[in-house]
Every structure is written in C-alpha cells, then in structure tokens.
Interface confidence: low
C-alpha cells in the first residue's frame, strides 16, 4: 500500500518536527533511523525514507553519488513526510542504482544517512 | 491483515494514572511510527505523541506537559500510552494510531471521575 | 503551535450535492494535511494525504486540493455513507494538529 508516513513499506510524516515544551527549548537534530539499503528490479518503484526531526524543523536535502537529486516529473521525486522526507523513484532503470544520501540541517548541526540502491 | 487492537475501557480518579495498550499484528511494529490521539465527548481529535519502535523515540505534544509516557514492548508487538495526574478535562477515547494514520485502534475509554 | 480551522463547521446536504469543505492553517504547512472521515462512535478514516493524494480504498468522488495555508476537501456527488464529521490534520510542524471538524448532516 502507498502511504506518506513510513520505511520501505510505508512512508512517514514531515520535516519540519518542532517541540516548544520547556524541555525541548534547546535546538537539537536526531537521525530516528539510519537510512535502509534496497534491492528491487528493472521498471519497479524505489522509496528511500530520511527519518529525522529537529528543532528548529531542519531542512533536507538528497543526494545521488555526491551530486544533489535532481527531481524528474512524475518519476523522481522527494517531499517532506510527517518524519523527515522520502525520495521516490518510479520506472526503475540500471542507471538509478547508487549511493543515496540525506543531509539534514537545522541551521547549527547537520546530520545524514546513507542508503544504497542496487 | 493489519490490526491494532486496544485495552479496554478504565475510569479513573482525578490525580490517578492510566496506561492504554494497543497490540499490532499484521506488520512489523518496529518500523512503523505509532501515534496516540485522543477525542473529548464532542472534541476535535487531539494529537499526544509517537513512539518509533525500533528504537524507542518519543515525540510528543507540550500541551501535555510531561504527563504522557509512551513506551513499547516489541516481543509482545505492544505499545502503550500512560496519562497521569488525570483530570476530569481527560475523559476521553484514546485511540493508537499506526504512523501514516491509515490504520487505527478501536479506541479506548478514559473516564475521569471523583 | 498550527491553529487549523475548518468551514463551514456544519451543514446539511442532498444525497448527489457537490459538497466542498475548506481547512485553513495559521502559517504555511505546504501540503502537509491529510483528511479523515469519522462516522458517530466509529474511528477517523483516512480520506486524503499529502493534500491531494487518494489513500487507498477510497472513491474517487472525494478529491482535495491546495498548499500553504488553504486547503478543499471535495466530494463529487455525496452520498448517503457520506453524511459524518470530516476532520484536517497538519503534519507539517509539532504538535501535530487536527480542525475543528465539518459535521455534514442530511437535509
């Protein structure tokens, strides 16, 4: 089933994770999963879950072999999920396979997750 | 199938604790966020929180004020949510919720009452 | 926090109405809402995601649309399973919030 929220089978929900309570006044950044390697086929869907949250909301970026993701229409694409944000790429071809990267930042830490998809 | 089954109804007196439980079967509960969200009588939903399972990290909502724990038991595929210091304003139906809020448990009554 | 507020909060309807529910949020969550249905005594269903995307198992006269901070949730032709409170939640910021509700009743 294809949802927003989760790993592999599911998605996740956003980026943008801020907690006020007066225990979480402080800025912090938490990687909640290292990033899952996946193995599929020719023509088949790819999702790669960031799974981060931060305060101040960190932003997200992707990675493919060191050069930022480039989105495609209607088959590359990534958008922030309740718990960071997935990259999803469609109508698999051998040159998708790689090294992925998320980079988060909140504006003073940065942390990532690398996954690999072959 | 996908199922997230719930403890049973509790009333409970002002300043107590309760601890709700919701059992998941069907998939893997390690990898998938759990949220509880609860409904006063004729209330909008309210978010309280998540567990990731797989490792054990909360989030939740500071309007609760460190009144809410959320904990897991994965051997039994078992999270559970405990409310304390209660009050009247928490009578609610608490419902567990699997991370993409695409399956939900049956909910659980909480009465609050002296 | 989000404050999310929904319009109308109630109103009645025909089985066969276009029926549009309006969610507003008090800064901009992109298009992270998702839309649920919940009958009287029975759990939220999830109706739409990410603002726009069908969940699974849902008809196809429900639609929605919008970003940033105005939202619709569509039906096409309401019918007589339809009538319940419909509910938005933003899942852009913590703590996660949900509207008030639009109750849609039979007139």
């Known amino acids: 089933q294809e949802t927003e929220l989760s790993v592999s089978a599911e998605l996740v929900p956003t980026s943008s994770w801020n907690i006020s309570s007066e225990l979480n006044k402080d800025s912090y950044l938490t990687l909640d999963e290292p990033m899952n390697n996946i193995t599929t086929s020719l023509g088949q869907t790819a999702e790669l879950h960031c799974k981060v949250s931060g305060n101040p909301p960190p932003t997200i970026r992707w990675f493919k072999n060191d050069a930022p993701v480039v989105q495609e229409p209607r088959r590359l694409s990534f958008r922030s999920t309740i718990y960071g944000s997935r990259l999803r790429i469609r109508n698999l071809d051998t040159t998708d396979t790689g090294y992925f990267q998320c980079v988060a930042t909140n504006g003073k830490e940065v942390v990532s997750s690398t996954g690999v998809l072959f | 199938q996908v199922q997230l089954v719930q403890s049973g109804a509790e009333v409970k007196k002002p300043g107590a604790s309760v601890k709700v439980s919701c059992k998941a079967s069907g998939y893997t509960l390690t990898t998938n966020y759990m949220h509880w969200v609860r409904q006063a009588p004729g209330q909008r939903l309210e978010w309280m929180g998540w567990i990731y399972p797989g490792n054990g990290n909360t989030k939740f909502n500071h309007k609760f004020d460190g009144r809410v724990t959320i904990t897991r038991d994965t051997s039994a595929s078992t999270a559970y949510m405990e409310l304390s210091s209660l009050r009247s304003e928490d009578t609610a139906v608490y419902y567990c919720?699997?991370?993409?809020?695409?399956?939900w448990g049956q909910g659980t009554l909480v009465t609050v009452s002296s | 926090d989000i404050q999310m507020t929904q319009s109308p909060s109630a109103m009645s309807a025909s089985v066969g109405d276009r029926v549009t529910i309006t969610c507003q949020a008090s800064?901009?969550?992109?298009?992270?809402l998702i839309w649920f249905q919940q009958k009287p005594g029975k759990v939220p269903k999830r109706l739409i995601y990410?603002?726009?995307s069908l969940a699974n198992g849902v008809p196809s006269r429900f639609s929605g649309s919008g970003s940033g901070t105005e939202f619709t949730l569509t039906i096409s032709s309401l019918q007589p399973e339809d009538f319940a409170t419909y509910y938005c939640?933003?899942?852009?910021?913590?703590?996660?919030?949900f509207g008030p509700g639009t109750k849609v009743d039979i007139k």
């Open positions: 919720a699997r991370s993409d809020f695409d399956y």
């Open positions: 990410f603002a726009t």
């Open positions: 939640l933003q899942y852009r910021e913590y703590p996660l919030t």
């Open positions: 800064q901009d969550i992109g298009n992270n």
